[in-house]
């Protein structure tokens, strides 16, 4: 799902009140609800009858710095028999997300938002057939 | 997929720095990649095996303001048929996410960052049974 | 210990609908379906459907489908059947019962039940 | 839909005796499900994936059957054992049970 454009309005002071200095606002160290969780489990990437691998990838100046992203295994789905069934598609699941990166310069470090798409899982689907004339 | 804490060595200054003044840390406006979008197929909702409907929660004082869940539609999976499978189940892909909570008094405004568990879609699968005595 | 504590008998009129609950205990809610089941005077069970609060999935035999109306509230971990358009045809005992997760056991594999709600339909 | 139609419809059994019921499938399932229903409560689980016994369940049941052929034996009856029991499947959309066994003491 999208994450829409922030224009220049949320991050601003209201009208009446003096503008931020230097383009830059106060972020609040910790985070709200931390401790919840996915209760995904049992390895359903494996189980899914359009499976996925993960892959995890590394950046120490980004928070979180684990973004793990999904790839569909086949691109038929599987069927009961545990084969592909080559006339449905496996099909990736993308949200956007945001995370956080860290800028320094020196003792002089500051924090900025990024958007990331991350591929969730997959999901079995009947392919739309475009007879073309 | 699940964001790991934070613990307190992210948002700080290296050890040879002063301390973030008052638990706060400096947030650039603006957002990485802010054009980046998803590219899913059509209608994967309702075309999957495993479909699903979408239900918007709106807080202006959140970035992004509009999530997006997803809940999945049927408890089993449609087969090719366009009935429901009760020997497979839908179960929802569910990813944690990091949204920004605006709080203000009078002109003082800060922001901090929450960590909110979407789900994204649903996928068919089997069942593991394993039955505890 | 899993408990299911549904709520009381009901007597109501023809046409009328009623809402009958289902709450929970000794297990994690939100993880595992609740299927609602019809018994008319002692006689066969019939399924009338499911619903999974994390998934949001819901499943309805076809034969109940502008009867029963199955919902969740996972703040007070209570599931509920409304039935409406009320009949003679409806005078029975209700039982919600919990099935699966979904990811260990199937959702339709049903294993504890509640105690029954009785409903009589007469003017 | 899938009927499972259960038989007898009523059966007696003395205890210590053998006691066999049987469930008939209109359609292949997987696997057969039992619940064991006594008067003025509800049903409990019973036999589940076929063959496998709920917990608490004493071992002189048992169950067996695949396709469209399955049944609930109990090797020596015993008092406690006189109740209804059902047959359910949930291999076919809508999940179905049996009309019951009423199983008596003489």
């Known amino acids: 799902r999208k994450i829409p454009k922030v224009g220049h309005t949320f991050f601003q002071k209201p009208e009446s009140c003096p503008p931020v200095p230097g383009g830059s606002m106060k972020l609040d160290i910790g985070i709200i609800n931390e401790n919840q969780r996915v209760s995904m489990s049992a390895n359903i990437e494996s189980r899914s009858t359009s499976p996925w691998n993960y892959t995890v990838t590394w950046d120490p100046n980004r928070y979180p710095s684990e973004v793990v992203q999904a790839q569909c295994r086949n691109l038929g789905c599987i069927n009961a028999q545990g084969k592909e069934d080559i006339s449905m598609n496996s099909v990736p699941i993308q949200q956007e997300t945001l995370v956080v990166r860290r800028k320094h310069q020196g003792c002089s470090v500051s924090f900025q938002l990024e958007k990331v798409l991350v591929t969730v899982g997959c999901t079995c689907v009947t392919p739309v057939i475009h007879h073309v004339q | 997929r699940k964001i790991p804490k934070v613990g307190h060595t992210f948002f700080q200054k290296p050890e040879s720095c002063p301390p973030v003044p008052g638990g706060s840390m400096k947030l650039d406006i603006g957002i990485i990649n802010e054009n980046q979008r998803v590219s899913m197929s059509a209608n994967i909702e309702s075309r999957s095996t495993s479909p699903w409907n979408y239900t918007v929660t709106w807080d202006p004082n959140r970035y992004p303001s509009e999530v997006v869940q997803a809940q999945c539609r049927n408890l089993g999976c449609i087969n090719a048929q366009g009935k429901e499978d009760i020997s497979m189940n839908s179960v929802p892909i569910q990813q944690e996410t990091l949204v920004v909570r605006r709080k203000h008094q009078g002109c003082s405004v800060s922001f901090q960052l929450e960590k909110v568990l979407v789900t994204v879609g649903c996928t068919c699968v089997t069942p593991v049974i394993h039955h505890v005595q | 210990e899993v408990q299911l504590q549904q709520s009381g008998p009901e007597l109501v009129k023809p046409g009328a609908s009623v809402k009958i609950s289902c709450k929970t205990s000794?297990?994690?809610?939100?993880?595992?379906?609740m299927h609602w089941v019809k018994q008319s005077h002692g006689k066969r069970l019939e399924w009338i459907g499911g619903?999974?609060?994390?998934?949001?999935?819901?499943s309805y035999n076809q034969n109940f489908k502008g009867k029963a109306t199955l919902t969740v509230d996972k703040s007070s971990s209570t599931a509920s059947m409304e039935l409406r358009s009320l009949t003679s045809e409806d005078s029975a005992v209700f039982y919600c019962a919990r099935g699966g997760d979904g990811y260990y056991t199937n959702y339709f594999d049903i294993d504890y039940w509640g105690q029954g709600t009785s409903v009589t339909v007469s003017s | 839909q899938i009927v499972l139609t259960q038989s007898p419809a009523i059966m007696s059994a003395s205890p210590g005796e053998k006691v066999t019921m049987s469930c008939s499938a209109s359609?292949?399932?997987?696997?057969m499900h039992w619940f064991q229903q006594k008067s003025g409560t509800s049903p409990k689980r019973w036999i589940y994936?076929?063959?496998k016994l709920a917990s608490g369940v004493p071992a002189r049941f048992s169950g067996s059957g695949s396709g469209t052929s399955y049944s609930l034996t109990i090797t020596d009856m015993e008092a406690e054992d006189a109740a209804t029991y059902y047959c359910q499947q949930w291999n076919s959309h809508p999940l179905t049970f049996g009309a019951g066994t009423k199983l008596e003491l003489i």
């Open positions: 359609s292949s399932v997987n696997y």
């Open positions: 619903i999974n609060p994390n998934s949001g999935g819901v």
């Open positions: 000794g297990y994690t809610f939100n993880e595992y379906t």
């Open positions: 994936d076929t063959s």
